[in-house]
């Protein structure tokens, strides 16, 4: 399997948006590449969301994603915005070598994010 | 030396306040009991807080202390307030049985106190 | 090593005084520390007889309480049991043990058998 | 007096298998509990305190948990060298009192 690297913690700002590299060891030069973001919570895996993107363009996720990101080499540059006390938990990044030939899948340890709810700010009068 | 349990994580509130359990396992009924609290961070050791107090009474911390406690048998309930992103580190709990003799340590691995600042609100115009 | 050691006669009249006394080597009984008296009649359970603290403070169990004294001698290190009016139930294996004040028994002596019996 | 009332009386295990002696307290005595193993001919050997701690040099094999009135003691896997009778203890209350003991056996 394919070595997957990434931070242990992030903590999420006051505005609930978390940003942490995912990098891996490529074992030769993939041109494309499908990124996908995990949580894992309570013992249960749901996808966060995904991007394939070919080598040196942007990561496209769809237009309702809570994810952005850039690459550089094997680096990417994930940021999860919109995040809530209650998305605290365990984000793990998957790698795919897609093409060429032949396919790897790497798996990171996971991020523990931590997410704080802001305080209300006072009503103006 | 005496065992002590305390979280291994906890996340301030966005008002700078963090909460934990430091539970001693005693090998008896002290009467007078001490609490410190220290903080770790780049491998520098400095000290929060400390209390002495008499089993089934409150823990007494000075007026100027950024701590509160209570405690329930072998267990301290600590409060630290007015903490700032700048304050994330490694808070580990010491206990220290004073009397009746013999004197009893323990030092609990240490909580991660994790402290976001929180954006500041707008304006009222 | 704390190390406590149990002497006494093994056999004792009904009626008269049981007396007991427990070495102790490794830590100073005046120091810290409970030290207790505990035993076992045959084939039974376990029976708390009562203690003298670090500072010569006692506490009996009070089904026994009018038949005990627990004393000490901190020149030699030791403390003794004393148990009056003795009959055959009071026929156990007897051992000294210590503990934190209300606290678990962490080191315990070989135990002495004494006998009531005419 | 705290009563401390242990069951079974006695248990006959199976080597390798889990053994489990309950310990109930005729009220509430926090996490002061501890479990004692005595073998024939020996004194009490302290085991487990405050209710879950492992003794200096007891094998994880044995375990404590509960609070308040119920308490119970685990071997994980029953070796031979754990034949013997098992007590707990409260020190929550003078007077200090024990179970009435488990004798625990090969099977």
């Known amino acids: 399997a394919m070595h997957v690297a990434q931070p242990a913690v992030v903590l999420a700002s006051s505005r609930g948006i978390a940003s942490f590299v995912c990098e891996y060891a490529s074992p030769g030069k993939a041109t494309e590449v499908r990124v996908t973001v995990l949580r894992q919570a309570d013992s249960q895996v749901t996808e966060v969301c995904a991007a394939t993107y070919m080598m040196g363009n942007e990561l496209t996720f769809l237009d309702d994603s809570i994810c952005t990101g850039t690459s550089s080499g094997n680096q990417v540059n994930l940021t999860i915005q919109g995040l809530r006390a209650m998305d605290t938990g365990l984000y793990i990044c998957k790698v795919e070598l897609m093409y060429p030939p032949p396919y790897y899948l790497g798996i990171g340890n996971g991020t523990q994010i931590y997410v704080i709810d802001p305080e209300p700010c006072p009503d103006s009068d | 030396a005496m065992h002590v349990a305390q979280p291994a994580v906890v996340l301030a509130s966005s008002r700078g306040i963090a909460s934990f359990v430091c539970e001693y396992a005693s090998p008896g009924k002290a009467t007078e009991v001490r609490v410190t609290v220290l903080r770790q961070a780049d491998s520098q050791v400095t000290e929060v807080c400390a209390a002495t107090y008499m089993m089934g009474n409150e823990l007494t911390f000075l007026d100027d202390s950024i701590c509160t406690g209570t405690s329930s048998g072998n267990q301290v309930n600590l409060t630290i307030q007015g903490l700032r992103a700048m304050d994330t580190g490694l808070y580990i709990c010491k206990v220290e049985l004073m009397y009746p003799p013999p004197y009893y340590l323990g030092i609990g691995n240490g909580t991660q106190i994790y402290v976001i600042d929180p954006e500041p609100c707008p304006d009222s115009d | 090593q704390v190390q406590l050691q149990e002497s006494g006669p093994g056999l004792v009249k009904p009626s008269q005084t049981l007396s007991l006394t427990c070495a102790v080597s490794g830590y100073s009984i005046s120091s810290g520390y409970y030290w207790n008296w505990i035993r076992q009649p045959p084939g039974k359970g376990l029976e708390w007889i009562g203690y003298?603290?670090?500072?010569?403070?006692?506490y009996y169990n009070p089904s026994l309480k009018s038949r005990i004294t627990i004393s000490r001698d901190t020149s030699k290190n030791q403390f003794s049991l004393k148990l009056s009016s003795v009959t055959a139930v009071d026929t156990a294996v007897y051992y000294c043990?210590?503990?934190?004040?209300?606290?678990?028994?962490?080191?315990w002596g070989q135990g002495t058998t004494v006998t009531v019996s005419s | 007096d705290i009563v401390m009332t242990q069951s079974p009386d006695s248990l006959a295990v199976s080597l390798g298998e889990r053994a489990t002696i309950n310990c109930k307290a005729s009220?509430?005595?926090?996490?002061?509990v501890a479990w004692y193993q005595q073998k024939p001919g020996q004194p009490p050997k302290l085991l487990i305190y405050?209710?879950?701690y492992r003794y200096s040099g007891v094998p994880d094999r044995f375990s404590g948990s509960g609070s308040g009135t119920d308490f119970t003691l685990t071997i994980s896997s029953l070796q031979a060298e754990d034949v013997a009778v098992y007590y707990c203890h409260q020190y929550d209350t003078y007077p200090l009192t024990f179970g009435q003991g488990t004798k625990l056996e090969i099977k």
């Open positions: 003298i603290g670090y500072d010569g403070s006692n």
């Open positions: 405050s209710t879950s």
């Open positions: 009220q509430n005595v926090g996490t002061y």
């Open positions: 043990a210590r503990n934190y004040y209300s606290g678990y028994f962490d080191s």
